[in-house]
């Protein structure tokens, strides 16, 4: 039955699709965007527990003029699924449950056998996602690689396929700035650099606070972070335009610590106003 | 940008002199912004380094305006913006790490005020 | 021989939670989901959802959602079902129901003896 | 959610005689798969309901051939050939095409 007049069943099982996704909820994914080579997957390694894998399954006859060829009920149709140490199967889901397969594993995860129907009829198209425990990336994974094998006892040679991405890790870190005020005003007369002993000589104070928010793990996993405040000290023409007095960076350094930040300021050694702090 | 910028320091000033710049170019610009970006201005880099980071770090500097220079170049000019900007760098043997949207732009306006007085 | 053994009858007061179990025996548990089928007195069939067991993926009636909850214990091929704010309306028998997986196999073959909840002040 | 409409709500039938329970659906219950989830249950009295034919027309085994399952799309009927005094119960017609999943309202077959 399903095997066409000639009763040898002739499967054409496809894997019309093998793309990495994110999770958006409980059956919701959405694709992960590609590497300019237009087959790899990205995959911003900050805070996603899992990665889902989308996979869409087909028995049609390769050839729609001549449907008798091929295309027949797949029996025993299977999905075998060999996962890198950085992945851990966790679970399939489908838009439609009518379309989940049945998908165990070993014993650690890295290895599942999904099975999509005994037959997989002619005609039939299913698409599911497999979701990946993505706990076992770290720093060092640069890339996922699953591969995939289809499997069926009915006639057809099969092959594996593979579904990439490219693991980079996305530092959650934000910054924002303020000035305070955001307006200043000059007047008076002028006066030469030497002339100035206290910082309430040179002109209008202003500060700057620029915070850094980390919403991921803390840095001293990944490296050592700098904190740059590009102040524009003078004008074209070599005169002073924002002379800086102080630079104090809180946090970043351990508890109650205050940070040294280099080059030193005020190097003309002013006198600082207390009363400004 | 994942390393920590060279640092420049800023060289002794001389004492004030009627600028090579002619008043009267600035006087064409009505709004001038001064930004090292677009090379208007010199910056120096200050670079704090973020030794032990979960969640928040604040960067304090205060600083002053230069009274005598604005008199001298932009006493005709109707505003200036004056723009700092800040960004994160990450030093890292990683190589597949990545920093989005670390950086910011603060500006502020300067104009002249012949009510004020200088200090304050 | 394929079973499906609940447990015993309950009386709850409204606003209390009632937690059904259902332990299935002679299959292997993750191989199929299980149903849970509800029945007024003299009343038709109500479906309140489906559980998973190999994943724990949960499919529920919006009728449901703010009070069902079903879980299962793999160690024990254990389905459970628990119901809150419970009210006189809910009063009924409770049955747990394995479900087929995929294509073909979509339907109950294989039912519980059924729990009565009573609802009752 | 699919309503499923079972008529007659009572069915009296003499032993022998053939019976025929009949199911609508308030929309088609052909699944994009090309399956068509209806089955049909018997409830007999003070037990679990039991599960007679799935998909339409498939035995569920260990069913007596007296029972037959036909339709499509929409409507749907439960032949039984011969009545026997066994069969005496609740018919349940149900869908799970699409969720949530739906019963009919059953159809109670007693002797006469």
């Known amino acids: 039955q399903g095997c066409g007049e000639d009763k040898i069943c002739q499967s054409n099982l496809q894997l019309v699709r093998a793309r990495f996704c994110t999770r958006v909820s409980d059956t919701e994914f959405q694709p992960l965007p590609m590497d300019v080579d237009g087959t790899t997957a990205l995959f911003a390694l900050s805070g996603q527990p899992v990665i889902g894998l989308e996979l869409m399954v087909t028995n049609l006859p390769s050839d729609p003029a001549q449907p008798q060829a091929d295309g027949d009920d797949a029996h025993e149709a299977q999905l075998l699924v060999m996962l890198p140490d950085s992945l851990h199967y966790s679970g399939v889901r489908a838009l439609d449950p009518a379309e989940k397969p049945l998908c165990l594993s070993n014993e650690n995860a890295s290895h599942v056998e999904c099975e999509l129907g005994n037959p997989m009829k002619r005609g039939a198209q299913v698409t599911f996602y497999l979701i990946l425990s993505t706990s076992g990336i770290s720093i060092e994974t640069t890339e996922l690689e699953v591969e995939l094998l289809l499997a069926t006892i009915s006639e057809q040679e099969l092959h594996p396929v593979s579904a990439r991405a490219r693991v980079f890790i996305e530092l959650p870190l934000s910054i924002a700035g303020m000035a305070i005020p955001q307006q200043l005003f000059f007047s008076g007369v002028v006066r030469g650099e030497r002339a100035m002993q206290s910082e309430r000589d040179v002109g209008s104070k202003v500060k700057y606070e620029v915070t850094v928010s980390n919403q991921g793990q803390s840095l001293r996993t990944l490296g050592s972070a700098f904190l740059n405040i590009m102040w524009p000290h003078e004008i074209a023409n070599g005169k002073w335009l924002l002379y800086p007095m102080q630079v104090e960076l809180e946090g970043g350094q351990g508890p109650g610590q205050k940070g040294l930040c280099s080059p030193r300021p005020n190097i003309l050694h002013l006198d600082v106003d207390s009363r400004d702090r | 940008e994942l390393e920590p910028p060279e640092q420049q320091e800023p060289g002794e000033r001389q004492e004030p002199s009627m600028s090579w710049w002619p008043v009267s170019s600035a006087e064409k610009k009505k709004n001038i912004t001064l930004d090292c970006a677009r090379g208007t201005a010199n910056c120096v880099v200050f670079s704090c380094p973020l030794y032990s980071f979960d969640r928040a770090a604040v960067l304090h500097v205060w600083g002053r305006l230069w009274n005598s220079t604005f008199l001298e170049e932009y006493s005709a000019v109707k505003s200036l913006e004056v723009i700092v900007r800040a960004n994160i760098t990450v030093k890292s043997s990683i190589k597949n790490l990545m920093l989005r949207d670390a950086s910011t732009v603060i500006p502020v306006m300067v104009y002249l005020d012949p009510m004020a007085v200088v200090a304050e | 021989e394929v079973q499906l053994v609940q447990s015993g009858a309950e009386v709850k007061k409204p606003g209390s939670s009632v937690k059904v179990s259902c332990k299935a025996s002679?299959?292997?548990?993750?191989?199929?989901?299980m149903h849970w089928v509800r029945q007024a007195p003299g009343q038709g069939l109500e479906w309140i959802g489906k559980?998973?067991?190999?994943?724990?993926?949960?499919r529920l009636n919006q009728e449901f959602r703010d009070r069902a909850t079903l879980t299962v214990d793999k160690s024990t091929s254990t389905a459970y079902m628990e119901l809150s704010s419970l009210r006189s309306e809910d009063t009924a028998v409770y049955y747990c129901?394995?479900?087929?997986?995929?294509?073909?196999?979509?339907?109950?073959?294989?039912w519980g003896q059924g729990t009565l909840v009573t609802v009752s002040s | 959610d699919i309503v499923m409409t079972q008529s007659p709500l009572s069915l009296p039938v003499t032993p022998g005689e053939p019976a025929s329970i009949s199911c609508r659906s308030s929309q088609s219950l052909v699944h994009r798969n090309g399956n068509t989830y209806l089955h049909w249950y018997l409830q007999k009295p003070g037990q679990s309901p039991q599960l007679l034919i799935y998909g339409v027309s498939n035995r569920f085994a260990g069913v007596p051939d007296r029972f037959s399952g036909s339709g499509s799309g929409t409507d749907f009927t439960l032949k039984i050939s011969r009545v026997e005094a066994e069969d005496v119960g609740v018919y349940f017609c149900?869908?799970?095409?699409?969720?949530?999943?739906?019963f009919g309202g059953g159809t109670k077959l007693e002797i006469k």
């Open positions: 129901a394995r479900g087929g997986y995929f294509g073909e196999k979509w339907y109950h073959d294989v």
């Open positions: 149900a869908q799970s095409t699409q969720l949530p999943y739906t």
């Open positions: 002679g299959y292997s548990f993750t191989r199929y989901w």
């Open positions: 559980i998973d067991p190999s994943d724990s993926e949960t």
